[in-house]
Amino acid sequence: LKGQEFAPSHQQVYAPLRADGDKPRAHLTVVRQTPTQHLKNQFPALHWEHELGLAFTKNRMNYTNKFLLIPESGDYFVYSQVTFRGMTSECSEIRQAGRPNKPDSITVVITKVTDSYPEPTQLLMGTKSVCEVGSNWFQPIYLGAMFSLQEGDKLMVNVSDISLVDYTKEDKTFFGAFLL
Amino acid sequence: LKGQEFAPSHQQVYAPLRADGDKPRAHLTVVRQTPTQHLKNQFPALHWEHELGLAFTKNRMNYTNKFLLIPESGDYFVYSQVTFRGMTSECSEIRQAGRPNKPDSITVVITKVTDSYPEPTQLLMGTKSVCEVGSNWFQPIYLGAMFSLQEGDKLMVNVSDISLVDYTKEDKTFFGAFLL
Amino acid sequence: LKGQEFAPSHQQVYAPLRADGDKPRAHLTVVRQTPTQHLKNQFPALHWEHELGLAFTKNRMNYTNKFLLIPESGDYFVYSQVTFRGMTSECSEIRQAGRPNKPDSITVVITKVTDSYPEPTQLLMGTKSVCEVGSNWFQPIYLGAMFSLQEGDKLMVNVSDISLVDYTKEDKTFFGAFLL
């Protein structure tokens, strides 16, 4: 078909054509997190704004209860940024005393829950050691990649420590996905 | 329509079909920045290469005067990376003297300007404290997400300190957007 | 065509329509790296998993011998994350002695090889100084942008030090591309 003018009568396509404006899409933005119980050995999930400001969901992509719900099977680009901020970690004090130590860390995981596998699947992980000396610190972790998802799959963002997440601005911490 | 051969006579689509090669797209790359006056309390905007090397604009997406001009309404993926480099910050010297201090920082903001709205909107922000001891330092900040933009919107990249931007290579600092 | 119902008889399109599910796409995930000889002054390339777990290639996008092979010309979004981890760098010891020093660093480069051009082209680079005091450290570098690629182009990911790459989990270090 390369370079050929569109002619419906002889066009051969191997999959149904699709109007781009009709594809499931979402961009969610940070809100203040309410402390919730989470399972031991499992990072807590963030909850999100899905309507106000820059946030939106469209074309059957729904947000509910910390999850983005995938409404149709296909390849999706999934992304998130979490900005963390904190005070000097204990690790830095130990370091100042000259004793090496396993550093404190910050971690973001984009997780998929699916009905075809009993355990949540970690799609993306960004993890960083934090060993700051004598100061407040702040930094983002960004993640994004393409995944084959199934109708009914659920996506969430988990973090190592919810109290370190910067929830002050919608442009600092966000989560999104769109069907390619 | 799933699994069904393309048959124009009975295809039902909820939005007009669109050839992908016809969508507005741009990838801009860094150039040496000329010092310019910028408003107090407002981060300066970077200007960009839009034609040479890896840089391009296409399908009515235009670059002019530090701005990417959105030629049609829709959902766009917008991204940028800025690589910063600098000498030891003052903060580290203060820290060495044992006094905690609000750290120096580096910040990138992707900003949208809309004629119908008086204030620029910050779409994406990456901000990081920098407290390096006794050395030159360098590091990138990457941002990317999807936004619903309107025809006539203008996008720019602002940074906290233009003198810290690494303009030496087109692959280190860049800015792009494409209609989904 | 805006807002107009799909009517094949009068639709005007400037490029052939294309079913999204038919586009070349790949997401590759990290595997343990086998030490290989690489040219002096050239960063070594990573090799990847292309079938198991989250990894896939589809629609004529093939992976072979560390390269993603571009099967058709067009605009692609290309991305990678590499998570590095290491022990205290020498740099930190020098710093502790109070002598400023060019810091150790970690670098990721997404490189394009084109048969018709003798030199590889660096599409994206993420480079970061690492000067950690008295601890193990770990951190990701993420890259992603859009490029106009030609059929037959080959993409690879190069790193400054293959021994520092975290190959333990498919969600930490990955590489992908998809036709827009």
Epitope: F67, P71, V113, T114, D115, S116, Y117, P118, E119 | - | -
Partner: antibody
């Protein structure tokens, strides 16, 4: 404590509709998936279908699709199964099952007999 | 449908014996699940993802395999292991179980 409790009539007349309810407690149903599996006397296990409670997406066993409906009421923490036009071959123990997080959890099962 | 063919349909072994059950899928699957069902009880997940042991399950149970051929093993049969064991695939629609293997003590 995570629990699933099936309830409904133990006897259904042929050609009628079998209706069962699964009431869950001890977890957030919306973050999981809820399935119905049945076991006919002396037979193996047969998956009937599932619902994703947050959005209501359903998948059914094609062999039962024309007769089976699974719904949910998240406010009541309940999932329901309806199987229409039953015959004696639908006599079975019906299990409600949670997936989407380890361990998967099964109800104790509800025996339904189809007989006139 | 993906058919699951489990063998043997029943077996009798002594306490301490190694017991192996196989399951063959009619087409390739990524993951296999193994359940234990005791009389009058609901099935209990033992193995997920072909080889992962579910929480609280004794280490004498194990699973292996990929593609179409999967194996479930009890390394040292215990009296409490008397049950029927089922394999299951979760990928194709419908989800399908093997017909079961009844394990008895000699």
């Amino acid at each position: 404590q995570v629990q699933l409790q099936e309830s409904g009539p133990g006897l259904v007349r042929p050609s009628q509709t079998l209706s069962l309810t699964c009431t869950v407690s001890g977890f957030d149903m919306q973050s999981t998936y809820m399935h119905w599996v049945r076991q006919r006397p002396g037979r193996g296990l047969e998956w009937m279908g599932r619902i994703e409670p947050a959005g209501g997406h359903t998948k059914y066993n094609p062999s039962l699709k024309s007769r089976v409906t699974i719904t949910r009421d998240t406010s009541k923490n309940q999932v329901s199964l309806r199987l229409s036009s039953v015959t004696a071959a639908d006599t079975a123990v019906y299990y409600c099952v949670r997936s989407g997080g380890l361990p998967d959890v099964w109800g104790q099962g509800s025996l339904v007999t189809v007989s006139s | 449908d993906i058919q699951m063919t489990q063998s043997p349909s029943s077996l009798s072994a002594s306490v301490g014996d190694r017991v192996t059950i196989t399951c063959r899928a009619s087409s390739s699957v990524s993951y296999m699940y193994w359940y234990q069902q005791k009389p009058g009880k609901a099935p209990k997940l033992l193995i997920y993802g072909a080889s992962n042991l579910a929480s609280g399950v004794p280490s004498r149970f194990s699973g292996s395999g990929s593609g179409t051929d999967f194996t479930f093993t009890i390394s040292s049969l215990q009296p409490e292991d008397i049950a029927t064991y089922y394999c299951q695939q979760w990928e194709g629609n419908p989800r399908t179980f093997g017909q079961g293997t009844k394990v008895e003590i000699k």
